[in-house]
């Protein structure tokens, strides 16, 4: 590979590293679960994530925070969308594990490929967000 | 050892303007989003604005907004408030914080903090 | 803007007392953004408190946060001479990113 092209990925790398995602993850996981309150979900399930959404949070309350944050960490990456790309796929990865079921992750993911449009970012064009243990072909 | 040290800090007519200057070290300044926090005398903590890692998210409180520019050098390690139009209630120490986050949980606090430069409006 | 009010404005009490500090918001505060600093005259704030409910490094166990929604609060325990300050709630989720004004908490 040629040097320009390793140091991109180094700076894409430490990029990451200083980037909070979670308010990223916390806004999707809100949008989803206030999706399926409305759709006779019990909003009072109990969670594991102490800074998940309260039944309170989750009808709207709250969430434009997670959203502003996220949406702050995400235009970080806005001049490099390979990077950006990584980002997503890192969100994807984070809360995969807390997905009940193929219906919510792929209704998470369709948020997920929304969120630098919403964010009034440029989103990027082939970003593979299948979670797999295996190695992923990104581009 | 991890410090900001704030200066800048003066007396100045209304009207007037002032740059401060807040110089990091001990740690990779580029790493972390900067914010600037006030106090008047006898008064709260007041924030007035913040960058984040490369300045492309900048906010501002409404008192300042039009008035006060922040911006953030990485190479020198160094952030700056420059403020013009000055007013009699602009009067205040300003302190220089670092933001940072949990980790595991994502958070954000102000963990580290200068020990301040005081700016006096005054005729 | 969120605004917080933090209540009372001065708290009176003995070393060996607990003390119960409140911080209500104007709308609705994600725990994630909820964050307690401690103030001791001709000093710089310190971080006391993160997420509602997280102690900082170095903070003892006597100092706790807690709450949700609009209303939080900082409890301390056993108050100890080193505790007087003035304690300050901050929320950092929405921009503008606003204080409390402050509760002052003095020995009686």
């Known amino acids: 590979r040629q040097q320009w092209e390793l140091q991109g990925d180094r700076r894409c790398q430490s990029q990451l590293e200083r980037a909070n995602l979670r308010p990223c993850e916390q806004h999707l996981m809100q949008k989803i679960q206030r999706d399926e309150d409305s759709y006779g979900r019990d909003p009072y399930s109990p969670s594991q994530d102490p800074y998940s959404p309260s039944p309170y949070d989750r009808r709207g309350a709250g969430s434009s925070q997670h959203q502003e944050r996220c949406c702050n960490e995400l235009n970080e990456f806005e001049n490099n969308q390979r990077c950006m790309c990584e980002a997503l796929q890192q969100i994807m990865e984070n809360q995969s594990d807390r997905l009940q079921g193929r219906q919510q992750e792929q209704q998470f993911k369709r948020e997920l490929r929304n969120l630098p449009q919403q964010c009034g970012l440029r989103a990027p064009q082939r970003c593979d967000l299948e979670v797999e243990s295996g190695g992923r072909d990104r581009y | 050892e991890v410090q900001l040290v704030e200066s800048g800090g003066g007396l100045v007519q209304p009207g007037g303007s002032l740059r401060l200057s807040c110089a990091a070290s001990?740690?990779?300044?580029?790493?972390?989003?900067m914010n600037w926090v006030r106090q008047a005398p006898g008064k709260g903590l007041e924030w007035v604005s913040s960058i984040t890692r490369s300045s492309r998210t900048i906010y501002y409180a409404d008192s300042v907004k039009g008035r006060f520019t922040i911006s953030r050098d990485n190479a020198k390690n160094s952030l700056y408030l420059q403020m013009n139009s000055l007013r009699d209630e602009d009067t205040a120490v300003y302190y220089c914080a670092r933001e940072d986050f949990d980790v595991s949980t994502g958070p954000y606090y102000m963990d580290v903090w200068g020990k301040g430069t005081t700016v006096t409006v005054s005729s | 803007e969120i605004v917080l009010t933090q209540s009372p404005g001065t708290l009176s009490l003995s070393p060996g007392e607990r003390a119960t500090l409140s911080c209500r918001a104007s709308?609705?505060?994600?725990?994630?953004?909820l964050v307690w600093y401690q103030q001791k005259p001709g000093q710089a704030p310190r971080l006391l408190m993160y997420?509602?409910?997280t102690r900082a490094t170095d903070i003892p166990d006597r100092f706790s946060g807690s709450g949700s929604g609009t209303d939080f609060t900082l409890t301390i325990s056993r108050l100890e001479p080193e505790d007087f300050a003035v304690y300050y709630c901050?929320?950092?989720?929405?921009?503008?990113?606003?204080f409390g004004q402050g509760t002052k908490l003095e020995i009686k």
């Open positions: 709308q609705s505060v994600s725990n994630m953004f």
């Open positions: 001990g740690f990779i300044f580029s790493d972390y989003n």
């Open positions: 997420g509602a409910s």
């Open positions: 901050q929320q950092n989720g929405n921009s503008p990113y606003t």
